[in-house]
Interface confidence: medium
């Protein structure tokens, strides 16, 4: 598994999101139905505190394509 170090902010956060989500694209805040802490966005979750790639994945726009 990947091992996170510290926090992700700014260009570093966008870079990592782009890589994790690829051509799926991503949201900076997830739809309310996909998260229990409704007010939190990715900046709060990953820039204000450390996060992992599994959490970043939840901000990807659509599920991975099969083709």
């Amino acid at each position: 598994a990947y091992r996170p170090s510290e926090t992700l902010c700014g260009g570093e956060l966008v870079d990592t999101l782009q890589f994790v989500c690829g051509d799926r694209g991503f949201y900076f805040s997830r739809p309310a139905s996909r998260v229990s802490r409704r007010s939190r966005g990715i900046v709060e979750e990953c820039c204000f505190r450390s996060c992992d790639l599994a959490l970043l994945e939840t901000y990807c726009a659509t599920p991975a394509k099969s083709e």
Epitope: A1, Y2, R3, P4, S5, E6, L8, E12, D15, T16, F19, V20, G22, D23, L53, A54, E57, A64, K65, S66, E67
Partner: antibody, heavy 117, light 111 residues
Framework: QVELVESGGGLVQPGGSLRLSCAAS????????MSWVRQAPGKGLELVSS????????YYADSVKGRFTISRDNSKNTLYLQMNSLRAEDTAVYYC??????????WGQGTLVTVSS | DIVLTQPPSVSGAPGQRVTISCSGS????????VSWYQQLPGTAPKLLIY???KRPSGVPDRFSGSKSGTSASLAITGLQSEDEADYYC???????????FGGGTKLTVLG
């Protein structure tokens, strides 16, 4: 054009250490994840370790976890692999590769690491 | 560990068409694209096909790739002696964020 040049390989005894370097040029280094891929003599390719653009996340194959450390110095456009507690089975050509989302689009020429007493 | 399965060797005569198969699972090929690399003797791997069927500039159109389900294949038409090399397929693990390779296939051009 993209160029990746590895160095630091050589002969080392079991239990010893080596530090590999990969000097990158011809592209914006900070825009890419980078990896080390190795190939044991007569064998196939094996992903050893990967690192995100700014070094925030690192991946290690189970076979090297706890012994190898990947890092990068974006100010020097250089990727590193610190290898400790080396074993005979670590003997391989180590390639530095540039990651795209789905593949490796550029490779270095490789540096040979031989672990033997 | 070798995650993707390839035949150890294939062969063909000059001018012929050969295919190399690559079998994976739903967590790699089934949900990600496949790439192929050519490794000539004594050299570093070279990207041959990416995103299942795209060729980087400079790669002849004799090389083509395809994917169906959890398997992929590389086809080489008009086989030439300089095509003799090792060929590796590669994909990505969907939620592990790492890349997986096949064991490699040695292509021998006969005659």
């Amino acid at each position: 054009q993209v160029e990746l040049v590895e160095s630091g390989g050589g002969l080392v005894q079991p239990g010893g250490s080596l530090r590999l370097s990969c000097a990158a040029s011809g592209f914006t280094f900070t825009s890419y994840w980078m990896s080390w891929v190795r190939q044991a003599p007569g064998k196939g390719l094996e992903l050893v370790s990967s690192i995100t653009s700014y070094g925030s996340f690192t991946y290690y194959a189970d076979s090297v976890k706890g012994r190898f450390t990947i890092s990068r110095d974006n100010s020097k456009n250089t990727l590193y692999l610190q290898m400790n507690s080396l074993r005979a089975e670590d003997t391989a050509v180590y390639y530095c590769a540039r990651n795209m989302y789905t593949h490796f689009d550029s490779w270095g020429q490789g540096t040979l690491v031989t672990v033997s007493s | 560990d070798i995650v993707l399965t390839q035949p150890p060797s294939v062969s063909g005569a000059p001018g012929q068409r050969v295919t190399i198969s690559c079998s994976g699972s739903s967590s790699n090929i089934g949900s990600n694209s496949v790439s192929w690399y050519q490794q000539l003797p004594g050299t570093a791997p070279k990207l041959l096909i990416y995103d299942n069927s795209k060729r980087p500039s400079g790669v002849p159109d004799r090389f083509s790739g395809s994917k169906s389900g959890t398997s992929a294949s590389l086809a080489i038409t008009g086989l030439q002696s300089e095509d003799e090399a090792d060929y590796y397929c590669q994909s990505r693990d969907t939620y592990g964020y790492y890349w997986v390779f096949g064991g490699g296939t040695k292509l021998t051009v006969l005659g």
